[in-house]
Interface confidence: low
C-alpha cells in the first residue's frame, strides 16, 4: 500500500476547524502478527526529507494520536485529545484525518501522517504524507478553510508566467518591428546623404555601403530569459508524497507485507492463458 | 456496475483437481481482498481463504491448506481458485467475494453468481 | 466448523418483530471482531445486510437492525414481510483459528 495526501496545503481562518486528511490506497494487513498504526505529528520541512523531526499537536505525541483499527475498541486515552480541540477519525476505505478544533496561529506548521506496518513489534515499513497548515490570524480573514495542492499552484504559475510572457512578446513585437524598421530607415537616410557626400567630393569612386546595422541598444538580449519550454517544464515539488523513511526509496512502495496473510510470499500473476 | 463473474459449473472425477475463475469488474481490482466461500447443498456458508490482489499473498483456513491454490492475474482483473485432491465433501457452489473495505475483517458486499462444483465417480 | 452458533429458524407473521442471535467466544466477537450478516434469498447469492457490527449499506431497509454485546451478536427484524423470507448467517474473524467464521444459518420463516 501507499499513502497519499489529498491536499498539501490548508489555509485557514483563526478560529475555525482544520481537518487534515491522509488516505491509504491498497489493501492493508492488520493480520494476527501484523499491526498497522496510523498517528500524526508536526514537523518541519527538512531539506533532504520532510517529516523527520517529530513534534507534539498541541502538546500530544504521536503515541497519543494513533487511530484505531475498526475491529480494536479504542483505549482510554485515545478521548483526552477530544479534550483539546483534536479528533481522529477514519473509514473503511483508507481515509484517516486528525481535526484541529478552533484553530490559531500556532497551529500553524507542517503536520505529518505516519502509517507504520508492523510485523510481531518490528516496524516494518513506515509511510509518510505531509501537508502544510497555514492560520491566518484576525477575525477578518475569511470564514472558512480552503484547502489545495501547492503543487498545483506551482504548475499554475508556471503556466501563467508562460503565457504572460507568450503575450508581452506578441504584443511588443509590433513595436519592435517598427523601431527596427525606423532604426534601418534612419540608417539608410543617413547612407544616402554620406554618398551624395561622397559623390560630390570624389566623383566615380563607388561606396559598396555594408548593410551591417549597428544593435540597437533598447533589445533585451535572448539570454536573460529562460525559453518557454523550461518555464512549462519546471518540476512541482514533491511536497512529501509517497515518502518513505529510507529518502532513496522509490516513491511507490512495494506491495504491503501482508494481511491476515504473515508468512507466504508473494504469489506471481498467473499467466493470461489461463483467463478464461 | 461492480461485479464478480465467475466460470461454469464443473463436474469432476474423486483425486482431480478444479479451477475456479472469478472475473471482476467495475472497481481498481488491486485495491480490494478478494475471498472463496463454499456452500455444500442445504448446508451453510464456509469461508475458505483470501488472497491480496495488490501483491498476490493468500491466506487459507486450516481445512484447505495443501489443497487450496489461490492466484490472481490483474491484468485480466480475474482470481482463480485451485482445489486439489477432491472428494464427494467437496460438491458444493463456490463463491468469490470482494471485500468491502480495505481493512482486515470487514464484509464482503459483491459476490459471484457461484459455481457448481460436483465431485462423482 | 462452525464456531458461531444460531439457532436453526425463526418465524413471524408479517408486520412482526423477530430477533436472530448469533453466540461466539472470546476468540472471535468477544475479541473486538466485526461481526456482519448476510441474507442469502433461496438460489442466490448472499448479500451484506448489516457490516460492522450495526451498519446498513445503501438499499437495506432500516427494518434491519443489529447489535453487538461481549460475545454476541443479534440480528432484528421489524415489520416482517414476505421477502425476508430467506437464510440469514452471522460472520466474524477468529483470531485462533485464523479465519472467518460463520454462524450455522438461520432460517426466516414469514408465517401466514
Known amino acids: 500500500f501507499k499513502v497519499t495526501t489529498p491536499y498539501s496545503l490548508y489555509v485557514c481562518p483563526e478560529g475555525q476547524n482544520a481537518t487534515l486528511t491522509c488516505r491509504i490506497l491498497g489493501p492493508v494487513s492488520k493480520g494476527h502478527d501484523v499491526t498497522i498504526y496510523k498517528t500524526w505529528y508536526l514537523s518541519s520541512r527538512g531539506e533532504v526529507q520532510m517529516c523527520k523531526e517529530h513534534r507534539p499537536i498541541r502538546n500530544f505525541t504521536l503515541q497519543h494520536l494513533q487511530h484505531h483499527g475498526s475491529h480494536l475498541k479504542a483505549n482510554a486515552s485515545h478521548d483526552q485529545p477530544q479534550k483539546h480541540g483534536l479528533e481522529l477519525a477514519s473509514d473503511h476505505h483508507g481515509n484517516f484525518s486528525i481535526t484541529l478544533r478552533n484553530v490559531t496561529p500556532r497551529d500553524s506548521g507542517l503536520y505529518c501522517c505516519l502509517v507504520i506496518e508492523l510485523k510481531n513489534h518490528h516496524p516494518e515499513q513506515r509511510f509518510y504524507g505531509s501537508m502544510e497548515l497555514q492560520v491566518q490570524a484576525g477575525k477578518g480573514s475569511g470564514s472558512t478553510c480552503m484547502a489545495s495542492n501547492e503543487q498545483d499552484s506551482d504548475s499554475i504559475t508556471a503556466a501563467a508566467l508562460a503565457t504572460g510572457a507568450c503575450i508581452v512578446g506578441i504584443l511588443c513585437l509590433p513595436l519592435i518591428l517598427l523601431l527596427v524598421y525606423k532604426q534601418r530607415q534612419v540608417a539608410s537616410h543617413r547612407r544616402a546623404q554620406e554618398l551624395v557626400r561622397m559623390d560630390s567630393n570624389t566623383q566615380g569612386i563607388e561606396n559598396p555601403g555594408f548593410e551591417t546595422t549597428p544593435p540597437f541598444q533598447g533589445m533585451p538580449e535572448a539570454k536573460t530569459r529562460p525559453p518557454l519550454s523550461y518555464v512549462a517544464q519546471r518540476q512541482p515539488s514533491e511536497s512529501g508524497r509517497y515518502l518513505l523513511s529510507d529518502p532513496s526509496t522509490p516513491l511507490s512502495p512495494p506491495g504491503p507485507g501482508d494481511v491476515f496473510f504473515p508468512s507466504l510470499d508473494p504469489v506471481p500473476d498467473s499467466p493470461n492463458s489461463e483467463a478464461i | 456496475q461492480v461485479q464478480l463473474v465467475e466460470s461454469g459449473a464443473e463436474v469432476k472425477k474423486p483425486g482431480a483437481s478444479v479451477k475456479v475463475s472469478c472475473k471482476a469488474s467495475?472497481?481498481?481490482?488491486?485495491?480490494?481482498?478478494m475471498h472463496w466461500v463454499r456452500q455444500a447443498p442445504g448446508q451453510g456458508l464456509e469461508w475458505m481463504g483470501v488472497i491480496n490482489p495488490y501483491d498476490g499473498r493468500t491466506s487459507f483456513a486450516q481445512k484447505f491448506q495443501g489443497r487450496l491454490t489461490v492466484t490472481r492475474d490483474t491484468s485480466t482483473s480475474t482470481a482463480y481458485m485451485d482445489l486439489s485432491g477432491l472428494r464427494s465433501e467437496d460438491t458444493a457452489v463456490y463463491y468469490c467475494?470482494?471485500?468491502?473495505?480495505?481493512?482486515?475483517?470487514?464484509?464482503?458486499?459483491?459476490w459471484g453468481q457461484g459455481t457448481m462444483v460436483t465431485v462423482s465417480s | 466448523q462452525f464456531v458461531l452458533t444460531q439457532p436453526s429458524s425463526v418465524s413471524g407473521a408479517p408486520g412482526q418483530r423477530v430477533i436472530i442471535s448469533c453466540t461466539g467466544s472470546?476468540?472471535?466477537?468477544?475479541?473486538?471482531?466485526?461481526v456482519h450478516w448476510y441474507q442469502q434469498l433461496p438460489g442466490t447469492a448472499p448479500k451484506v445486510l448489516i457490516y460492522?457490527?450495526?451498519d446498513r449499506p445503501s438499499g437495506v431497509p432500516d427494518r434491519f437492525s443489529a447489535s453487538k454485546s461481549a460475545t454476541s451478536a443479534s440480528l432484528a427484524i421489524t415489520g416482517l414481510q414476505a421477502e425476508d423470507e430467506a437464510d440469514y448467517y452471522c460472520v466474524a474473524w477468529d483470531d485462533s483459528l485464523k479465519a472467518y467464521v460463520f454462524g450455522t444459518g438461520t432460517k426466516v420463516t414469514v408465517l401466514g
Open positions: 460492522g457490527n450495526s
Open positions: 467475494a470482494k471485500q468491502m473495505g480495505i481493512w482486515d475483517y470487514d464484509a464482503f458486499d459483491i
Open positions: 472470546s476468540s472471535n466477537i468477544g475479541a473486538g471482531y466485526d
Open positions: 467495475g472497481y481498481i481490482f488491486t485495491d480490494y481482498y
